[in-house]
Structure formats: structure tokens, C-alpha cells
């Protein structure tokens, strides 16, 4: 039960986790107006992965796309590139782990294949939690080394009597929901691995367990025991002579080509 | 349509306090922001301040312990009050309708306010 | 605060030749954002409310005559009347609408010669 659980829960994770990594790349405050020197200002300027937008004061907002490709900053080229990984990896993650739900029965798919597949999903979790906080870390230290650099420049060349407040950006919203996002889809993932642990047939581990039998006249069958995997509730050797009433965590299938010693 | 319209007593003693009202039509109050004026007799524009469509407010630095800008949706109506008036507060009030650019767009006709006793 | 500087304080032009009135503001009105100027421009004339103008230091609202036109950038902007006729005599204010408060020049009167 508890695998089922694991498994299950690092979906619904995982899940979530994309939904905000998606969320993130699409919002348009990745960065917004600094207003600690101008705190009384009129308008209101905030820039996203795909386009920047100036809210005015009266409530019109202004939106336009960075309809050049070359003309971009590699930096928030490579932001992008990370985050569409990201979302790519979450998404082939998702349709792999539905797939690999131990829940959903597919006509005769055997646990080692579940079991794969949830592992495939996980990593595939992981590397898409490890993008999007990659991307939104690079554009976080982007932003800080901009911010001081133009608070450096404010400072210098106001000899004149024409003072110009250079715009400064900040942390956005989408920054901290891309953190908070690539998190959860990387717990997501580990979760799923460790459900995949829990998943895995180990009947071949009873061969070795066969080898340290002393003289007791004990007979291992296929089946007879569920072996430990050092997981959870599966610590202890499970009898299946129950009555027939078992959870699904303790259906056994048979040896297959799958090794998980 | 849009359209504004000021009111509230054309004559103020000195020390009390001035309340005007503005009654908008033509346009929602929870979307755009209305300013309020004042032109002295033969003198030039001065903004009082400014309540948005959410609510928030701005004043002049000049003013901002005196004035309250406040709004009753319900009613349609946004209201100005300005304490402890004296002489040089005698003038022509509007309140205009904030646009593009921040820029006012419509202005109520003017209400003219005399501080005397 | 942002101070606007209106000049000339008074204007007279002979019909049909060109008006110039000119503001400067004490910080710049230019918004990194959209690359936009937020300067407007008013026409006040006697015993009426100001008429919005020219909003983003150069964008014409609807209904006004083409002949009005502002121009400028950052701290310092024109407002051109290309050929003058007897319905522009008024007083032209210009309004910073980029830092609260939202300040205005002083008043430019605009006579006919």
C-alpha cells in the first residue's frame, strides 16, 4: 500500500510541479520595477521570458513581444532553452508515470515494466525540476548583476542639473513560483524512484537467499515470500498463504529478465 | 458617454473643511482612476490628487496631511475633502477622468469654491 | 518632486504661421519600458475645463486637428501649432504623468498677433 501511495503522491507532485513550471514560463514578471528609489512612479514596468509589459497608473497595460531572436541576451535565450527542457522532460514524465500508475491496470503489464516505468519517470522528473531551477536561478543571477550594475551608474555622470532615474529591475513572481515549481517536480521524482524500488519484483534476490539456507528443510518457491528490499513496510518476509486477501503491494508477479538486488 | 460632474457648497469658511463630490457616468470606477484639480482665480492647473480603479490613492506632497479621496461605487460618485482650508485654497475644483498615458482625458465642467468668512 | 518649466509664459503668433511652446522637466519623463515619454499636453480656453491634447509627449487624441503635434524626448518638449487659427487662443499646460505628484507647468498663453 504504501508504494501505491509513494507513487501516486509523487505524481500528483510531480504534477503540480509542472503545472507551476508551465505557469512560470509563461507569466510575464520574471523581473519587475524596482520601486525603492521611485516609489511614487506613475508606471509600472515588469518583463517576462516573452514579452515586457508597462502597467500605467490609470490601468492600462501595455504588453510587447520580443519579436527578435537574435537581438535576445544568450542568457535569457538559454533561460528559455532550460525552461522548454524543462517543461518537455515534465511533460513525457507525466504521460510515462499515468502509464506506470500502479492503480491503473493496462491488459497484462507486468510490475517489472511498471516498475521501469516509473523509474524512467522519475529521472525524468528530476532533470525537469533540475532545468526549470537552473532556469530561473540563472535569470535570478542575471537580474542581480544588473540591479548593481545600474545601481552603479545611477551614482555616476549627475553632475548636471537634469537628474535620470535609470530603471532598475527585481525579483518577479514567476522567479519564486519557478523555484517552488522546479522543487516540487524534483520531490515528485524522487518520489517516484523510490516507489520504483518498492515496485520491482525480487524473486531473483531468493536465489541468494537460497545460498545462505543452513540445514532447515525450507522450500522457496516462486512466490512463497516477498523478499526485502530495505523499503518501508517490505522489511519483513510476507507469507501469501492469507486467505487470498492481500493489498495490492503484495501481488506477486514472476521472475522476469529485471534484476533489483 | 462620459461624462463628470462636480458639486458641493460654493462657499467655505476658513479652518473648516471643503467637501465636493464628483458624479461619474459613461465609464466604470473600477477600472480607470479620477484626478481632482484646482485652478486659483487667474492662476495656472494644480493636481490635488488621484483614487485608481482599485482604490489606492496618491496625493500632492503639499497637501497630503489635509485631503482624503475616497469613492462609493455603488453611487457612482468619487469625493474630495480638504481640511483646515484657508484663503489661498479658494478656487475653481475639477475632477477629470484618467486615460491613456495617465493622461486626463475628461474633466467635469468645475465647481468654483470661495474660503471666506 | 518633478518641476515643469513652461516657456514663453505668453505666445502672440500671426494666424496662419506656426506656434511653438516649449517644457522642461526637472527628471526625465522617458519610460525604459515601452521607450515612452510620459508628457501630456492641455488647451485651456476661457471659462472652459482644459482639453486633453497630446498624451506620450506626442501621440494626438482623437478629435484634435492635426496641426497640433508635439515632439521631444527625456526632459525637454514641443508642443508646434504648424498654422495657427482664431479657435487655438487658449492657455497650453503641460502635465508630467510619469512620477506622482502629477505635476503641471506653469501656463503658456497663446494670442493672436
Known amino acids: 500500500m504504501a508504494v501505491t501511495a509513494c507513487q501516486g503522491l509523487g505524481f500528483v507532485v510531480s504534477l503540480i510541479g509542472i503545472a507551476g513550471i508551465i505557469a512560470a514560463t509563461c507569466m510575464d514578471q520574471w523581473s519587475t520595477q524596482d520601486l525603492y528609489n521611485n516609489p511614487v512612479t506613475a508606471v509600472f514596468n515588469y518583463q517576462g521570458l516573452w514579452r515586457s509589459c508597462v502597467r500605467e497608473s490609470s490601468g492600462f497595460t501595455e504588453c510587447r513581444g520580443y519579436f527578435t531572436l537574435l537581438g535576445l541576451p544568450a542568457m535569457l535565450q538559454a533561460v528559455r532553452a532550460l525552461m522548454i527542457v524543462g517543461i518537455v522532460l515534465g511533460a513525457i514524465g507525466l504521460l510515462v508515470s499515468i502509464f506506470a500508475l500502479k492503480c491503473i491496470r493496462i491488459g497484462s503489464m507486468e510490475d517489472s515494466a511498471k516498475a521501469n516505468m516509473t523509474l524512467t519517470s522519475g529521472i525524468m522528473f528530476i532533470v525537469s525540476g533540475l532545468c526549470a531551477i537552473a532556469g530561473v536561478s540563472v535569470f535570478a543571477n542575471m537580474l542581480v548583476t544588473n540591479f548593481w550594475m545600474s545601481t552603479a551608474n545611477m551614482y555616476t555622470g549627475m553632475g548636471g542639473m537634469v537628474q535620470t532615474v535609470q530603471t532598475r529591475y527585481t525579483f518577479g513572481a514567476a522567479l519564486f513560483v519557478g523555484w517552488v515549481a522546479g522543487g516540487l517536480t524534483l520531490i515528485g521524482g524522487v518520489m517516484m524512484c523510490i516507489a520504483c524500488r518498492g515496485l520491482a519484483p525480487e524473486e531473483t534476490n531468493y536465489k541468494a537467499v537460497s545460498y545462505h539456507a543452513s540445514g532447515h528443510s525450507v522450500a522457496y518457491k516462486p512466490g512463497g515470500f516477498k523478499a526485502s528490499t530495505g523499503f518501508g513496510s517490505n522489511t519483513k518476509n510476507k507469507k501469501i498463504y492469507d486467505g487470498g486477501a492481500r493489498t495490492e503491494d503484495e501481488v506477486q508477479s514472476y521472475p522476469s529478465k529485471h534484476d533489483y538486488v | 458617454q462620459v461624462q463628470l460632474q462636480e458639486s458641493g457648497p460654493g462657499l467655505v469658511k476658513p479652518s473648516e473643511t471643503l467637501s465636493l463630490t464628483c458624479t461619474v457616468s459613461?465609464?466604470?470606477?473600477?477600472?480607470?482612476?479620477v484626478s481632482w484639480i484646482r485652478q486659483p482665480p487667474g492662476k495656472g492647473l494644480e493636481w490635488i490628487g488621484v483614487i485608481w480603479g482599485d482604490g489606492s490613492t496618491n496625493y500632492h506632497s503639499t497637501l497630503i496631511s489635509r485631503v482624503t479621496i475616497s469613492k462609493d461605487t455603488s453611487k457612482s460618485q468619487f469625493s474630495l475633502k480638504l481640511s483646515s482650508v484657508t484663503a489661498a485654497d479658494t478656487a475653481v475644483y475639477y475632477c477629470?477622468?484618467?486615460?491613456?498615458?495617465?493622461?486626463?482625458?475628461?474633466w467635469g465642467q468645475g465647481t468654483l469654491v470661495t474660503v471666506s468668512s | 518632486d518633478i518641476v515643469m518649466t513652461q516657456s514663453p509664459d505668453s505666445l502672440a503668433v500671426s494666424l496662419g504661421e506656426r506656434a511653438t511652446i516649449n517644457c522642461k522637466s526637472s527628471q526625465s519623463l522617458l519610460n525604459s519600458g515601452n521607450q515612452k515619454n510620459y508628457l501630456t499636453w492641455y488647451q485651456q480656453k476661457p471659462g472652459q475645463p482644459p482639453k486633453l491634447l497630446i498624451y506620450?509627449?506626442?501621440t494626438r487624441e482623437s478629435g484634435v486637428p492635426d496641426r497640433f503635434s508635439g515632439s521631444g524626448s527625456g526632459t525637454d518638449f514641443t508642443l508646434t501649432i504648424s498654422s495657427l487659427q482664431a479657435e487655438d487662443v487658449a492657455v497650453y499646460y503641460c502635465?508630467?504623468?510619469?512620477?506622482?505628484?502629477?505635476?503641471f507647468g506653469g501656463g503658456t498663453k497663446l494670442e493672436i498677433k
Open positions: 459613461g465609464f466604470s470606477l473600477t477600472s480607470y482612476g
Open positions: 502635465q508630467n504623468d510619469y512620477s506622482f505628484p502629477l505635476t
Open positions: 477629470a477622468k484618467a486615460g491613456r498615458g495617465n493622461a486626463l482625458d475628461y
Open positions: 506620450w509627449a506626442s
